[in-house]
């Protein structure tokens, strides 16, 4: 039959950052192609990435419809050159993915310090709010829109002349911190979802930004 020489996909893995979500799998195809299906636990299967020779499929458009749902995907293997025929009744080999709940499992992307402004002994540090592909009423939502107060930022700040890192935290995208007058400070931020308990609860640190460089303003 037409599927006897095909190999089922394996090592199905979700790769997701700020809700941009790709399903990856193995093996690299030899004389076969793949089609992916995705569904919620209670929903119907929807096919994506038809007869592809790739070993990944971007499922962002599907999961952003409801990021709090739990999704399951499966990858079907077909012989190369396969054409869908109404007469074929044999189900091709397939493999299921692990379940995936975007709200709980998407990784937090590296944040960026948008700006900082010093007024006397106070510095206001603003974290850039990243846009996601999640929509509400035809409007794209930011990371803050999606996570609300579940998302916090930790600011690490230190005198340029010192190694000890002070911390501040916010559940907005702004920090207002006290600094010593006449001292230059450096800043780095980290996104955190404290309610998570696994490795994806923190982002990597933002690039370090220091006073005296272009992102900052100083006013007396």
């Amino acid at each position: 039959s037409g599927t006897t020489n095909t190999v089922a996909a394996y090592n199905l893995t979700w790769k997701s950052t700020n809700f941009k979500t790709i399903l990856e799998w193995e093996p690299k195809p030899i004389n076969q192609v793949y089609t992916v299906q995705i569904s919620t636990k209670s929903g119907d299967w929807k096919s994506k990435c038809f007869y592809t020779a790739d070993t990944e499929c971007d499922l962002t458009d599907e999961i952003v419809k409801d990021v709090k749902q739990t999704y399951l995907a499966r990858v079907f293997s077909y012989p190369a050159g396969h054409v869908e025929s109404t007469g074929s009744t044999e189900e091709p080999p397939y493999e299921n993915s692990p379940e995936f709940t975007p709200y709980l499992e998407t990784n937090l992307g590296q944040p960026t310090i948008q700006s900082f402004e010093q007024v006397g002994t106070k510095v206001n540090v603003t974290v850039q709010d990243e846009w996601t592909l999640v929509r509400r009423n035809d409007t794209f939502l930011s990371l803050r829109d999606v996570f609300g107060k579940d998302l916090i930022y930790t600011l690490y700040y230190w005198k340029s002349s010192s190694s000890g890192k002070k911390t501040a935290k916010t559940n907005t995208n702004e920090f207002l911190i006290d600094v010593d007058k006449g001292e230059n400070y450096c800043f780095s931020v980290q996104a955190v979802i404290p309610s998570r308990r696994t490795a994806n609860r923190k982002s990597t640190d933002s690039p370090v930004e220091c006073m005296g460089h272009e992102k900052g303003e100083s006013r007396e």
Epitope: G164, T167, A168, I177, Q190, V192
Partner: antibody
């Protein structure tokens, strides 16, 4: 079950060194912040310092700065407090504690403590 | 550094009494205040976080409140197991600082 277990305390002479360990189980230290807090006999709680194992960032209380160093080994899920140039006033029970890194950052889990006595 | 001034340093009370402990921060700390209970020879245990939120597993007789830079821990009806020392702590900024402690003793 989340657990922190300190070890390495003991009697040391003034000027000596000691390394305390804080072994974590039930969670990954790499995605939390770990603090060291001490309590001198009959006294209150004094914060010593912290480490964020994800980036190695640390900060120390003025009373220990330059003498104490906090480090972490994420592969062993353990944080350390290296104490050098010890003084009599460093005598205390030393606790490690986990910071949940929420906005208010309470220390939600503490170890049982290990006693360090600095005396000749 | 932010100072946390806790009062009283000790108090005597009876089972069933309502007990109030206060902490005053030397500057604004928003709601970043926690309360801990410590019994002799044991590690502190978290009771209240974010000034007024009861930590998981803590009896509802414990409560916390905030008024500006003043923070209060209230035990509505003191139980025998509540005799201990209580500490407030701010973690609004580094370094986090503790109050001096309040020892609650049996009258």
């Amino acid at each position: 079950e989340v657990q922190l277990v300190e070890s390495g305390g003991g009697l040391v002479q003034p000027g000596g060194s000691l390394r305390l360990a804080c072994a974590a189980s039930g969670f990954t230290i790499g995605v939390y912040i770990i603090h060291w807090v001490r309590q001198a006999p009959g006294k209150g709680l004094e914060w010593v310092g912290y480490i964020d194992p994800s980036n190695g960032y640390t900060y120390y209380a003025d009373s220990v700065k330059g003498r104490f160093t906090i480090s972490a080994d994420t592969s062993k899920n353990t944080a350390y407090l290296q104490m050098n140039s010890l003084r009599a006033e460093d005598t205390a029970v030393y606790y490690c504690a986990r910071d949940d890194q929420s906005v208010s950052s309470p220390f939600d889990y503490w170890g049982q403590g290990t006693l360090v006595t600095v005396s000749s | 550094d932010i100072q946390m001034t806790q009062s009283p340093s000790s108090l005597s009370a009876s089972v069933g009494d309502r007990v109030t402990i206060t902490c005053r921060a030397s500057q604004d700390v928003n709601t970043a205040v926690a309360w801990y209970q410590q019994k002799p020879g044991k590690a502190p245990k978290l009771l209240i976080y974010s000034a007024s939120f009861l930590y998981s597993g803590v009896p509802s007789r414990f409560s916390g409140s905030r008024s500006g830079t003043d923070f209060t821990l209230t035990i509505s009806s003191l139980q025998p197991e509540d005799f201990a020392t209580y500490y407030c702590q701010q973690h609004y900024t580094t370094p986090p600082t503790f109050g001096q402690g309040t020892k609650v003793e049996i009258k």
